[in-house]
Amino acid sequence: EVEKTACPSGKKAREIDESLIFYKKWELEACVDAALLATQMDRVNAIPFTYEQLDVLKHKLDELYPQGYPESVIQHLGYLFLKMSPEDIRKWNVTSLETLKALLEVNKGHEMSPQVATLIDRFVKGRGQLDKDTLDTLTAFYPGYLCSLSPEELSSVPPSSIWAVRPQDLDTCDPRQLDVLYPKARLAFQNMNGSEYFVKIQSFLGGAPTEDLKALSQQNVSMDLATFMKLRTDAVLPLTVAEVQKLLGPHVEGLKAEERHRPVRDWILRQRQDDLDTLGLGLQGGIPNGYLVLDLSMQEALS
């Protein structure tokens, strides 16, 4: 807390300008009117205040707006935003995407701070859903943003927003998140032709069910091994050797290098060795010839 002291004669601030950087903390407290500061917030960012001085300016705004700052002030906080606590930000009502962008710009190039996370949360909740423009903005500043959301939060993403997602935005997503995003992507890209569709859907395929993989295998997509290795194991297991061969196209040779890793390892164990041999890759571990395969899950369903 800065002590209340009278402003020295002739030092009362008539406007927010560069002369204030030479004011001591107590002088800022005594000589800068909070209402003046609020109306000239757009100037603060251009003035080289120290963070110690910004603390004083924040204190003045807190006194003026105990219930939370209005958006007209928030939009121009600039570096003062870094002085806000998550508790401060929870009092705000941020509705403008321009305000969000302005504040994210301040933190650009740095990890997502608790302040930024709270700001985004407030903004998205205020909008009711993660629309395309918001998602566009957030992933531009934080490519991993989408994968930081829970499956429940992702469920509020409308399919139209999926167009804003780039492959790198999904790098850190786990299968549970892709399970939610894949159906939205499928819906978003449904009117595209085969090859264009595959390019767009590829990074979401970690959430694809078996039937969709079977359908893709009929379209000469030539899936690369990196994508194949990210598929759900339970979706890959029912695929036949012929289907996997068609799905991977020329990349099928890469299975050999991955035969000890999931989902390739588990898939091999489910295939007849005879069928695996047709690939000519030397894949071992399939079901020996002459053995009968009982699908116990089907048997249970019938009984």
Epitope: P48, Y79, L82
Partner: nanobody
Framework: EVQLVESGGGLIQPGGSLRLSCAAS????????MGWHRQAPGKGLELVST???????YYANFVKGRFTISRDNSKNTLYLQMNSLRAEDTAVYYC?????????WGQGTLVTVSS
Amino acid sequence: EVQLVESGGGLIQPGGSLRLSCAASGNIGSIRHMGWHRQAPGKGLELVSTITTVGTTYYANFVKGRFTISRDNSKNTLYLQMNSLRAEDTAVYYCRATAHPTDYWGQGTLVTVSS
């Protein structure tokens, strides 16, 4: 983190000149602006001069025309050229870097102006 180390202080006669240096290291890419502050014996800390990343400079009235602040980005060093020194310039001079999201300070260098 940003580390700052000042040098160049010493005993100088009134009317003389000194050049202070401040070598910055660490996360220097996060620095927004840097400055020189001073604290005279028994007095509070006061800002002498500031320079922004784009080279805009600001001076306190009591040093205008006598002191010059500059930066050498290739050496990550901040300078304060002090000319026409007076007895009242005697103080510990501190280098400060305002970087994301705090202020970093050097340990200070003593300048004594005395005949």
